[in-house]
């Protein structure tokens, strides 16, 4: 299997909510002996490998943000801990999984990584990750809503309809 990142760059104004997305691709074994551990973390573009370093997202580690289930089952983090930090990770039946970040600040800018670990009984684990950049902007040059740039081309897409401005 592989992990696809539909968008490689998200450009958002301060205060906006954004959902970063990854997609599990390829043959996914739905047998009882296979489960998937999915999580998110911040990283840096390392010289050797992107996403090798695991840093917290808003002080929450990848351990706090994980999802565990078999195949294309739906799941989400219901932890109060994540929600208190304005975060929620979720997964649907189609292999998509995401992390939603609310009320973005400039400190949220950086590289984000999704990680999938395939756990197959009595076999070695198979790890795959995807990377995407989040740029949070302020001032007159900031977009009014999040703009996303597809990984395959640099044609931008406005995602206003999906990510509403945060209200207190």
């Amino acid at each position: 299997f592989k992990v696809a990142t539909p968008y490689s760059l998200y450009v958002c104004p301060e205060g906006q909510n954004v959902t970063l997305t990854c997609r599990l691709l390829g043959p996914v074994d739905k047998g009882h002996d296979v489960t998937f551990y999915k999580t998110w973390y911040r990283s840096s573009r390392g010289e050797v490998q992107t996403c090798s370093e695991r840093r917290p997202i808003r002080n929450l580690t990848f351990q706090d943000l994980h999802l565990h289930h078999g195949g294309h089952q739906a799941a989400n983090t219901s932890h109060d801990l994540a929600q208190r930090h304005g975060l929620e990770s979720a997964s649907d039946h189609h292999g998509n999984f995401s992390i939603t970040m609310r009320n973005l600040t400039l400190l949220d800018s950086g590289l984000y990584c999704c990680l999938v670990v395939e756990i197959r009984h009595h076999h070695s684990e198979h790890r795959v990750h995807g990377a995407m950049e989040l740029q949070v902007q302020t001032g007159k040059d900031a977009p009014s809503n999040c703009v996303v740039y597809p990984s395959s081309s640099q044609e931008s897409e406005n995602i206003t309809a999906h990510h509403h401005h945060h209200h207190h």
């Epitope: 489960t35 551990y37 090798s52 351990q63 994980h66 009595h122 070695s124």
Partner: antibody
């Protein structure tokens, strides 16, 4: 910060049994994949057994297979290791440790000493 | 099972010196290797994960390198609290295995 505390160690005769417990503080023990690791006096570390967060799969080192049984009770935030047919070579400090997928042993208890001697 | 061989068994150095510890795997473990530090009477502590990344709170004087079968842990300038036993561990395959350890002692 979550803590792991082992208990149940002690002196037992060869062929005897012992049940070790590992109590986890915090609300997310049901998210934890766990292992038992042991260390004989003055020796190195040896992985013993693993259990996933849901209780399956379970793995054992060849040296304890058929004699040791790992289990967990998520409602009680507890991990267990039932040790039967104990041998002198099982004498060690036994640690429980978090063992998340794609990760390493990042959270350890302080250990409990098991001594197998006549 | 994958056998991890650490060398040297003991390293005698003075504070401020550079320590270089080696771990060799009997077959490739990719970069799925960690280093732990253990002091007497304490549980091991994760230092380095995935061969080259420092765990949370680990000082910059600790660094890891390598992939495949050959790995190195380097302590750039030994502090008094660094004298301990160091273990490598792989998680590329079952069973999880550790090296036999390298003791870093004060010269």
């Amino acid at each position: 910060q979550v803590q792991l505390v082992e208990s149940g160690g002690g002196l037992v005769k060869p062929g005897g049994s012992l049940r070790l417990s590992c109590a986890a503080s915090g609300e997310t023990f049901s998210d934890y994949y766990m292992s038992w690791i042991r260390q004989a006096p003055g020796k190195g570390l040896e992985w013993v057994s693993y259990i996933s967060n849901s209780g399956s799969p379970i793995y054992y080192a060849d040296s304890v297979k058929g004699r040791f049984t790992i289990s967990r009770d998520n409602a009680k935030n507890s991990l267990y290791l039932q040790m039967n047919s104990l041998r002198a070579e099982d004498t060690a400090v036994y640690y429980c440790a978090r063992d998340l997928p794609g990760w390493y042993f990042d959270l350890w208890g302080r250990g409990t000493l098991v001594t197998v001697s006549s | 099972e994958i056998v991890l061989t650490q060398s040297p068994a003991t390293l005698s150095l003075s504070p401020g010196e550079r320590a270089t510890l080696s771990c060799r795997a009997s077959q490739s473990v990719s970069s799925y290797l960690a280093w732990y530090q253990q002091k007497p009477g304490q549980a091991p502590r994760l230092l380095i994960y995935d061969a080259s990344n420092r765990a949370t709170g680990i000082p910059a004087r600790f660094s890891g390198s390598g992939s495949g079968t050959d790995f190195t842990l380097t302590i750039s300038s030994l502090e008094p609290e660094d004298f301990a036993v160091y273990y490598c561990q792989q998680r590329n395959n079952w069973p999880r295995t550790f090296g036999q350890g390298t003791k870093v002692e004060i010269k």
